[in-house]
């Protein structure tokens, strides 16, 4: 009653092996690390036969099949390169997973590289079987700013891909007869969030209480360079608008909200995110020069009768830009005080301008970001939203434009985008 | 310390246009809308209608579309109402408030005497 | 539009005595946010109005908190608990929930 020789399976082993087998013995058929047993085209760890009372097997000794781990997960904003001929996905093979760069970065600085293990799943070293994460990178223009620029009151014409976290709000209440319509600007941080001033986004019918414009009623174009040629920017609707809970009509305090859009929109050479700053009450430093894009009133004589007459013709068509130095708080604060009116410049705002005037912002620019370069990360990082001035025209001898100081801002915003700031660390000025 | 300053009175034979202004101080001009209010000799208060000043977009009762134009300069923190083709139903007294629902400030008031 | 009717047209009250004008609307001023916009002015002979209430119960700054509002969505009343001399004028309620907004005709509060 012996049963045959048994010869092992190719990449596998017969355990106990014996010169003889009886009646009754049991073999255990198994796989080298990295391979499979594979009977009846079922995979198994282990496969156990037996000598019949007969003089046979009680099955065919199975097939030791390498291990697969198929196609890798997509790996959203990257791409998927093989280390391997054939694109083999197979035990002991390579991947590396990168992000579409320069528009996203990988969090953490991961190798991204996975290899196929004996368990038939990919492995990261750090991250297990988990997927990178590509994060949007923020404040890395495609084109670089140059260093002279003039001003939006007066203009000077931003090129194509400058300011890629420029946004133009437009909020149209057509609930009202006649219909309301006014615009401002904002900042991508996100590919789902803009940043903005919160008077931008409330409904001045109502005085008494703070209420948000309705989602259905504001459209976010990015990418936009001539407001006359929307076609080659990215428009969405806003799925919430968030305004800050603090926000105060009477003096613009805690001027500062979010819009979530209704889809993430592709990053590209013009739609990018700009940093946030460090969580920093200082804000930036008095004499910093700063940079603000707008398509505001770029002639300071227009009154907003004829914007509206005109429709959106006295917007500049294109986008226009200026360089502003932070002022000195004590300085700005008492600019104010000394006018007639009861103007206060909190600890949540900051100004910028120049004492004689000339250059500045204005009306239709209220929510644009004021960036300030960050040597140490070599990024542009947005430290004010435009948010207030006068009364006097704009560009009025000393009379400062006021910015909301977003640095007060940071953990909010973090929270309302429901991003804890340690997931999102690439994202924060170093 | 806010205020809100009418020009003076006005008196006028029908057919003619009156600009009344109203100067907003002590507040951002562009945060409140204003209101326009109408109130005849020994009678009631009516509301004409407010304009938006941070869109500049004017909203008329029905009585008051047609003739009656409201405008802003807001380099000025200034709103104005303009009364075209003036009647002698025009006589009365026009006030500006804060607000598209505050009413928390009122102009002094503008009286517009219409005569022939 | 909605119409807001005050009562008593005329009101003529004791120093000292407390007072109450009520104000009944057309339509329920409750707004879809929730927030009920019924204002009370009080427009002193010669003089321009001045707001004492808003959004029914909230007395502005400076306002004395003998006065009070109160109601919702069609009837509302301002109450003074003790008139003072300084309290005559005409009275106005005032809908900011429906277009257009709309004043009460005024109740006239005199000094006995």
């Known amino acids: 009653n012996e049963c045959p020789e048994l010869q092992p399976p190719v990449h596998g082993k017969i355990e106990p092996s014996q010169a003889k087998y009886f009646f009754k013995d049991q073999v255990l058929v198994s796989c080298d690390t990295g391979y499979k047993v594979l009977k009846d085209n079922v995979e198994m760890d282990t496969f156990q036969i037996e000598c019949l009372k007969d003089g046979t097997w009680s099955n065919k000794i199975p097939t030791c099949k390498i291990v697969d781990c198929r196609a890798p997960g997509e790996l959203e904003h990257g791409l998927i390169t093989f280390s391997t001929r054939n694109n083999l996905t197979t035990y002991k093979s390579e991947i590396k997973y990168s992000c579409q760069e320069p528009y996203y970065k990988m969090l953490n600085n991961n190798t991204g590289i996975y290899t196929c293990s004996a368990q038939g799943v990919w492995m990261n070293k750090v991250l297990g079987r988990s997927l990178p994460t590509c994060l949007p990178e923020c404040g890395q223009p495609s084109r670089s700013l140059p260093s002279l620029v003039k001003r939006i009151i007066g203009g000077r014409n931003a090129e194509p891909g400058l300011f890629p976290w420029q946004a133009l709000i437009v909020v149209e209440d057509t609930s009202r007869v006649p219909n309301d319509k006014w615009f401002g600007s904002g900042a991508l941080l996100s590919a789902s969030w803009i940043l903005t001033a919160a008077h931008v986004l409330r409904s001045q019918r109502r005085d008494t209480t703070v209420i948000p414009v309705s989602k259905e009623h504001v459209t976010v174009y990015l990418g936009l360079h001539d407001v006359r040629d929307k076609s080659g920017a990215v428009n969405s609707s806003a799925a919430r608008v968030v305004l800050h809970p603090d926000f105060n009509i009477q003096n613009y305090n805690h001027d500062i909200a979010l819009v979530q859009l209704q889809e993430p929109v592709p990053l590209g050479p013009h739609v990018m995110p700009v940093c946030l700053p460090r969580l920093e009450p200082e804000g930036p430093a008095p004499h910093m020069l700063g940079l603000v894009a707008g398509w505001g009133i770029s002639n300071p004589n227009v009154t907003v009768d004829e914007i509206i007459s005109s429709g959106t013709r006295t917007l500049s068509d294109v986008l226009q830009y200026v360089k502003l130095p932070v002022v000195p708080h004590a300085e700005c604060k008492t600019s104010y005080e000394s006018r007639s009116g009861n103007y206060s410049v909190t600890e949540n705002m900051f100004c910028a301008g120049y004492y004689e005037g000339g250059k500045d912002t204005c009306l239709g620019d209220s929510g644009g970001a004021f960036v300030i370069f960050d040597d140490l990360s070599q990024r542009w990082v947005v430290q004010g939203l435009v948010s207030w001035g006068g009364p006097e025209e704009c560009g009025s001898k000393q009379v400062y434009g006021v910015y909301t100081k977003v640095s007060n801002y940071v953990d909010w915003v973090w929270e309302q985008m429901g991003l804890p700031q340690s997931v999102v660390e690439p994202q924060v000025e170093r | 310390q806010i205020q809100l300053v009418q020009s003076g009175p006005e008196l006028k034979t029908p057919g003619e246009t009156v600009k009344i202004s109203c100067k907003a101080s002590g507040y951002i001009f562009t945060s409140y809308g204003i209101t326009w209010v109408k109130q005849a000799p020994g009678k009631g208060l009516k509301w004409m209608g407010w304009i938006n000043t941070y869109s500049g977009v004017p909203t008329y009762a029905d009585d008051f579309k047609g003739r009656f134009a409201f405008s802003l300069e807001t380099s000025a923190s200034t709103a104005y109402l303009q009364i075209n083709n003036l009647k002698n139903e025009d006589t009365t007294t026009y006030f500006c408030?804060?607000?598209?629902?505050?009413?928390?400030?009122w102009g002094q008031g503008t009286s517009v005497t219409v005569s022939s | 539009d909605i119409v807001m009717t005050q009562a008593p047209l005329t009101l003529s009250v004791t120093i000292g005595q407390p007072a109450s004008i009520s104000c009944k609307s057309s339509q329920s001023l409750l707004d879809s946010d929730g927030k009920t916009y019924l204002s009370w002015l009080l427009q002193r002979p010669g003089q321009s109005p001045k707001r004492l209430i808003y959004l029914v119960s909230k007395l502005d700054s400076g306002v004395p908190d003998r006065f009070t509002g109160s109601g919702s969505g069609t009837d509302f009343t301002l109450k003074i608990s003790r008139v003072e001399a300084e309290d005559l004028g005409v009275y106005y309620c005032w809908q900011g929930t429906h277009f257009p907004y709309t004043f009460g005709g005024g109740t006239k509060l005199e000094i006995k």
């Open positions: 408030t804060r607000g598209g629902d505050a009413l928390d400030y």
